[in-house]
Amino acid sequence: EQAPGQAPCSRGSSWSADLDKCMDCASCRARPHSDFCLGCAAAPPAPFRLLWP
C-alpha cells in the first residue's frame, strides 16, 4: 500500500515501498515479483523468448 502523504502514482504505475517511488506497471512483465506489481491490474506475461531465449 502507498505510504501516507505520498502523491498518488500516475495511471499505469504503482507505488513501490521497496524502491520508495512509483514504478511502471509495464516493468512487471520483466520483474513480476516486485512489490509494486501487486498494485498493477494485470502483469502481462513475458514473451516466450524473453523468458527462455
Epitope: G12, L19, M23, D24, C25, A26, S27, R29, A30, R31, H33, A42, P44, P47, R49, L50, P53
Partner: antibody, heavy 119, light 111 residues
Framework: EVKLEESGGGLVQPGGSMKLSCVAS????????MSWVRQSPEKGLEWLAE??????????HYAESVKGKFTISRDDSKSRLYLQMNNLRAENTGIYYC??????????WGQGTTLTVSS | DIVLTQSPASLTVSLGQRATISCRAS??????????MQWYQQRPGQPPKLLIK???NLDSGVPARFSGSGSGTDFTLNIHPVEEEDAATYYC?????????FGGGTKLEIK
C-alpha cells in the same frame, strides 16, 4: 550520485582476449539487471549481453554475434560487472558501455571504454 | 531480430519549434496494455541517456518538453519547444524480446 565506471579497454590483436570491468556506485547494484552495449560507427548501438539477479540464478542472455565468444558476469559483493571477450576480431572494435536497468531498459550508463582490435 | 528504422536520419529545427522523430519496428512491440519501446538522447562525447520508457513514460528528471507516443510498430518522439541543449542524436530501443535492438539514430541540429 549514480556512477558506472568501465575499465580494461585498449588495443588488442585479432584473435586475442580482453576482460572489461565496470564498478558501480550510487544505486542498489544487486537489484539491477546489468548489460554491456557497444557503439561503433559501422553498427551504431548494439546490445551485447545481459545478466540478471541472484534471484534469477544470474541468468545471462547474449546477442547472437557474441554468443560463445563473450561471457558476462557480476560480483554483487563488489558491485562489479565484467565482460570476458575471446577470439576478438576487427568488427569488435568500438566503445563498450556498462549499463544498468531495473528491468528491460537502460537507466544508467557509464562513460564507456574503447576497445580497438587491430594488428 | 526486430529491426528498428528511424526517420529522418537528421533534421534541423529552429529554436522554440517542434522536433518530431519516428521509429518503426519490423513487428509489433506492444501488448493491449503496454508498448516496449524506449528513447535515448546522446550528446556528442557522452553516453546515451534514457528519456522515455515504455513508449510514453518520461524518466525522472527529463523535461516535460519531451514526449513519446505510439503503439504496435509506429512510435514518435516529440520535443517542443526545442532548446539549444537538445542538439543530440536520439535513439529508439525495443525490449519486446531478446535481443534488444536500437534504431540507427536521428541527429537533431538546432538553428
Amino acid at each position: 550520485e549514480v556512477k558506472l565506471e568501465e575499465s580494461g579497454g585498449g588495443l588488442v590483436q585479432p584473435g586475442g582476449s580482453m576482460k572489461l570491468s565496470c564498478v558501480a556506485s550510487g544505486f542498489t547494484f544487486n537489484n539491477y539487471w546489468m548489460s554491456w552495449v557497444r557503439q561503433s560507427p559501422e553498427k551504431g548501438l548494439e546490445w551485447l549481453a545481459e545478466i540478471r539477479l541472484k534471484s534469477d540464478n544470474y541468468a545471462t542472455h547474449y546477442a547472437e554475434s557474441v554468443k560463445g565468444k563473450f561471457t558476462i558476469s557480476r560480483d554483487d559483493s563488489k558491485s562489479r560487472l565484467y565482460l570476458q571477450m575471446n577470439n576478438l576480431r576487427a568488427e569488435n572494435t568500438g566503445i563498450y558501455y556498462c549499463t544498468g536497468g531495473f528491468a528491460d531498459y537502460f537507466d544508467y550508463w557509464g562513460q564507456g571504454t574503447t576497445l580497438t582490435v587491430s594488428s | 531480430d526486430i529491426v528498428l528504422t528511424q526517420s529522418p536520419a537528421s533534421l534541423t529545427v529552429s529554436l522554440g519549434q517542434r522536433a518530431t522523430i519516428s521509429c518503426r519496428a519490423s513487428q509489433s512491440v506492444s501488448t493491449s496494455s503496454y508498448s516496449y519501446m524506449q528513447w535515448y538522447q546522446q550528446r556528442p562525447g557522452q553516453p546515451p541517456k534514457l528519456l522515455i520508457k515504455y513508449a510514453t513514460n518520461l524518466d525522472s528528471g527529463v523535461p516535460a518538453r519531451f514526449s513519446g507516443s505510439g503503439s504496435g510498430t509506429d512510435f514518435t518522439l516529440n520535443i517542443h519547444p526545442v532548446e539549444e541543449e537538445d542538439a543530440a542524436t536520439y535513439y529508439c530501443q525495443h525490449s519486446w524480446e531478446i535481443p534488444y535492438t536500437f534504431g540507427g539514430g536521428t541527429k537533431l541540429e538546432i538553428k
